[in-house]
Every structure is written in C-alpha cells, then in structure tokens.
C-alpha cells in the first residue's frame, strides 16, 4: 500500500483539506470520491458539480483538495483511489464539529426570596458533539444536572441547576459556560440574581461622639435599615414603656434632649418590607453628670444578633459600673 490519507476534523462553515498522497508513483490515475462514492476529482479535473471543492495541488505524488463552507452533511469517508496493479484505495474520514447554535439561560423566577430554592436552566442547542455545560455563581463553580437530546446527529444539552439563594447572592451573576471542541475561548451567558430579603437593622449613636450618655446631655440615634425591597417603614418604639415626651422622631433618627435617668430603657428600631420585619434594640443607661475629676473614657458597646443570638459583644475596657450591653440587632 503506497496510498496515504489523514483524517480531518473541521468546524462547520470552515475549510477542510483532503490529501491523497502517493509514495511510489507510476503516473496512475488518482481520484477522490465522496461518501456516496461519486467522483469529486479525477486527476486534476472535477466532474462533480459541487464547486465548494477546489484543487489545491495535483502531482504524480499528491492530490490535494479543499472543501469550503463545510456542513454536517459533508461528514463521512472520502476515498482516494489509485489505478495501480492491483488498484489501491484509502479513505479519510471528515468529522464536522458544530458549535452550539445558541445558548439560553432561563431562571424560574425573576426575583427570588432569601432561603428559597430556585431552578435555573441552560440550553446549548444543536451542537456536535454534545456540549459540556458548567455552572458558576460568581467565581464559585456549582454542579448542575445535564440531559442530552439527540436529533439527526446533533445534540441539544439542557443543564438544570437547583440553587438555594441567600441575601448575599443579590446582584451576583449565575453563569452558564460552554465547553466544546468547536468553541475557542469562553462561550457563556449569564443572568444576575435578584434576591429579596428582610431588612437588616443597625442602630448607630451619632451623638454624643464619645459614646457615654450622662444626665443633661443630648442623645441622637440613627437607625440604618437595609433590605430588598428597601424598607418603607422605619419606626422607633420604647420597649415596655412610652416614648419620653421630650423625644423627637425624624425619619430614621431619634433625638432625646436633656437626658435624665427616667429615660433609661430599651429603644427599638423596627423596619419591615414585603419579605419580613426585623428590629434592633438600644439599651440606654444615663450616667450621673461628671464630677470635678473627669472619669476615664469608655467605648461604645455594640451587639449584633440574628434571631437573638449575640454574635459580637464589645464591652467597656474596664470592669465596673459602665460595662453594659448597649445595642442588640434582631
């Protein structure tokens, strides 16, 4: 056997090169046939009416042909024939790769609520071979479940991702990424998660700055409530008591002028949205006015809790009368 060919892999729409090589030539006729065994080239002549085939080289040792705009129907065995004694035949297989036609991502719900499990589907249509789909939430890879549907040598892959969403996922992209031999670089599509969550409430003491509340001083507390959708209602209440007469409420701010010991107690900021409600408590303790010897400075105590679990407690740096919990978030 002195007739040689090489298999060809080509992407749909691109150019395939078919080469029939002869080692020891005796000027015999060489011809190239398609998978239907129709003659494409007979020596340097193309009897076949398909003008996508063009002669690249013809000599006693080689017949080299290009096939432009390759389609899936061109796939198969192409035969080189040499009219020697005995006649020789060798075949080359053209494999056509088809990248996915389009990539569609579909989220079950446009807006999800924290804690909810949502279904995200990604479909890569009509590729050959079947596409591999990978999922990412931001930079984190997730595991999906793929189903492959075959139709006429083409594959449609649908991957399903079940995703439990958290508030931190709001605005994070869910990425469907395709891996396929006909695709170079990154072929991906993404959708941004929209996650609704109940408010997170945080109280900040904006006055006095040093954080120590004494008789006769003023107190200003600001309630920060962040949620999705943004809370419409932010209200201040005094737990187990009436709000002091001299307290002034202005949106998220609470002002109490001329503090006295009767103002001691727990002040609660409540916020709500369509997902739910939350609150944060501030425990006010009014200290005696300063004596002639100034007392040591103290730090503000802030406690953040979720469902009454205290996550952080910052207390006064020295033990004693002023070491108390000041704010608790719920």
């Amino acid at each position: 056997q002195n007739l040689f060919t090489k298999d060809v892999t080509v992407i749909e729409g691109e150019v395939a090169t078919i080469s029939c090589q002869v080692n020891k030539s005796d000027d015999s006729v060489i011809q190239l046939l398609n998978p239907n065994r129709q003659t494409i080239y007979f020596r340097d002549f193309r009897p076949l009416k398909d003008s996508r085939f063009q002669l690249l080289n013809f000599s006693s040792s080689e017949l080299k042909v290009s096939l432009t705009n390759v389609s899936i129907s061109d796939e198969g065995r192409y035969f080189c024939q040499l009219y020697t004694d005995p006649p020789q035949e060798s075949y080359t297989t053209i494999t056509v790769l088809v990248p996915p036609r389009n990539l569609m991502i579909d989220i079950q719900k446009d807006t999800a609520v924290e804690g909810e499990e949502i279904e995200v589907n990604c479909t890569a249509m009509a590729s050959k071979p079947a596409t591999t789909i990978r999922w990412f939430k931001g930079n984190t890879e997730l595991k999906g479940k793929s189903e492959v549907e075959e139709w006429s040598d083409m594959y449609t892959v649908t991957s399903q991702l079940m995703l439990k969403v958290h508030k931190e996922d709001d605005g994070v992209p869910v990425i469907c990424q395709v891996e396929h031999p006909a695709v170079t670089g990154n072929l991906q599509t993404q959708r941004y998660l929209e996650v609704q969550y109940k408010p997170q409430v945080h109280i900040q003491m904006t006055y006095p700055l040093q954080g120590l509340t004494r008789e006769g001083d003023a107190l200003e507390l600001t309630c920060e409530a962040i949620g999705k959708p943004q809370p419409v209602m932010v209200t201040w209440v005094r737990v187990d008591d009436e709000m002091p007469q001299h307290a002034v409420l202005s949106g998220p701010n609470l002002f109490i002028n001329n503090l006295n010991k009767t103002d001691n107690g727990t002040y609660r900021c409540e916020a709500s949205n369509i997902v739910g409600k939350a609150h944060s408590d501030y425990m006010l303790y009014v200290y005696d006015p300063p004596t002639t010897i100034p007392p040591p400075t103290t730090t503000t105590t802030t406690t953040t809790t979720t469902t009454t679990t205290i996550l952080t407690i910052i207390t006064d740096s020295r033990a004693g009368e002023e070491g108390s919990i000041r704010a608790v978030d719920h």
Epitope: D27, V29, T39, F45, K49, S51, D85, P87
Partner: antibody
C-alpha cells in the same frame, strides 16, 4: 502526441468471434483506463466497458456480460476487445477511447460487419 | 434512471446561435461532456466540466448546466459545425452513459 490506432475492418459470420486491437502511443499506457464504445449504423454511441491496463481489471456493461472480453498487453501498449457469439445486430463501428473522466482521445474506429 | 435524453434534431441559420440540451438524473451530480461526430469520423470532445474546451476547439462552443439539464451552445454557427452531438455523463455506478444524440443542421 497521443494516438490510438485500431485494427482494420472485419467481416464475421453470426456465432463467430471478433478481436479488435487498439495501440496506444504518446502517453503512459498504464496510466489511463481504456474504454470501448460501439456505434451501430445510423445509431448513437453505446458504452461497452473498460479495462485497467495497469492491473488488467475490467468492468463490462450488463448488456455484454458473458460475451465480451477485454485484455491488454502492456509490453506493446495495446488493448484488445473480443466479442463472441456474434449476431447481425453486432454490426457496428467499434471505438477504443482513453478515459480521462471524459474521452479525450478516440481510436479511428473498426467496422465489424456480421453477415451470413 | 441512467438515461440521457436529447432532442433528435435541431437546425440553425448560418451565424446564428443554437442550444442543444441533455437531460438526466446523473446531471444533478456530474457535469456533462459533449462530443461532436461528423459522418464517417470518430467523436471529438468539444466541452467538458463546467465549461472547459480542449485545445483546438473554437470558443463559439460553450457549456452550461442547471439541475438535471446540461446545455451545449454554439454561438455563431458555422457550416463545419453541422454534425451529430452527444452528451455523456456517469451513472450511479460510475459507468459512462451517452445521450441519444442530436443532429445539428446548419442552414
């Protein structure tokens, strides 16, 4: 230049055989198939078959299977076509033609007359 | 079917254009070849492939193809173009098949 020279006219009786020769020159004889085509008086061209001069392999038209034999002698670059069990309707001009997908060169033709 | 059909005869005035057609299934796949045969002579290849002329064939001969029909056109027919014209292609087995032939008369 390429030339195909055929043997002279033949008159044969029905049932006999005829062997027509075709001598090639001006090209590599083994490099091209040789075909045989015949034409009855006032009729069109009729393909009979081919021989691969390199291997001696043949392919005959269904109509002539069992009656035609194509051979070659590469030492003298000559192809032969023998038709046996001749009938009166085998009266025709017999041509050899070089196959370059199309027939780019033809012999001058050999008239074979079959008559009692 | 492995038959190629041609009109039996056509006539053309000297210097005018004549078109000969050849029809057959194999012509969907392959280009036809065209041969000119004058009385008492062997056929001569005049057109092959998409529209190729062997050397020595005048450029008034041209070929074209569409679907299952091949055509030979003689533009500005001359007296010496009076002859029989045969188309030729290959069947599904790769064997040659000739057309029925067209007699061209130049008036």
């Amino acid at each position: 230049q390429v030339q195909l020279v055929q043997s002279g006219a033949e008159v044969k009786k029905p049932g006999a055989s005829v062997k027509v020769s075709c001598k090639a020159s001006g090209y590599t004889f083994t490099g091209y198939y040789m075909h045989w085509v015949r034409q009855a008086p006032g009729q069109g061209l009729e393909w009979m078959g081919w021989i691969n001069p390199n291997s001696g392999g043949t392919n005959y038209a269904q109509k002539f299977q069992g009656r035609v034999t194509m051979t070659r002698d590469t030492s003298i670059s000559t192809a032969y076509m023998e038709l046996s069990r001749l009938r009166s309707d085998d009266t025709a001009v017999y041509y050899c033609a070089r196959d370059n997908w199309n027939y780019d060169y033809w012999g001058q033709g050999t008239l074979v007359t079959v008559s009692r | 079917s492995s038959e190629l059909t041609q009109d039996p005869a056509v006539s053309v005035a000297l210097g005018q254009t004549v078109r000969i057609t050849c029809q057959g299934d194999s012509l969907r796949t392959y280009y036809a070849s065209w041969y000119q045969q004058k009385p008492g002579q062997a056929p001569v290849l005049v057109i092959y492939g998409k529209n190729n002329r062997p050397s020595g064939i005048p450029d008034r001969f041209s070929g074209s193809s569409s679907g299952s029909t091949a055509s030979l056109t003689i533009t500005g027919a001359q007296a010496e173009d009076e002859a029989d014209y045969y188309c030729d292609s290959r069947d599904s087995s790769g064997n040659h098949v000739f057309g029925t032939g067209t007699k061209v008369t130049v008036l």
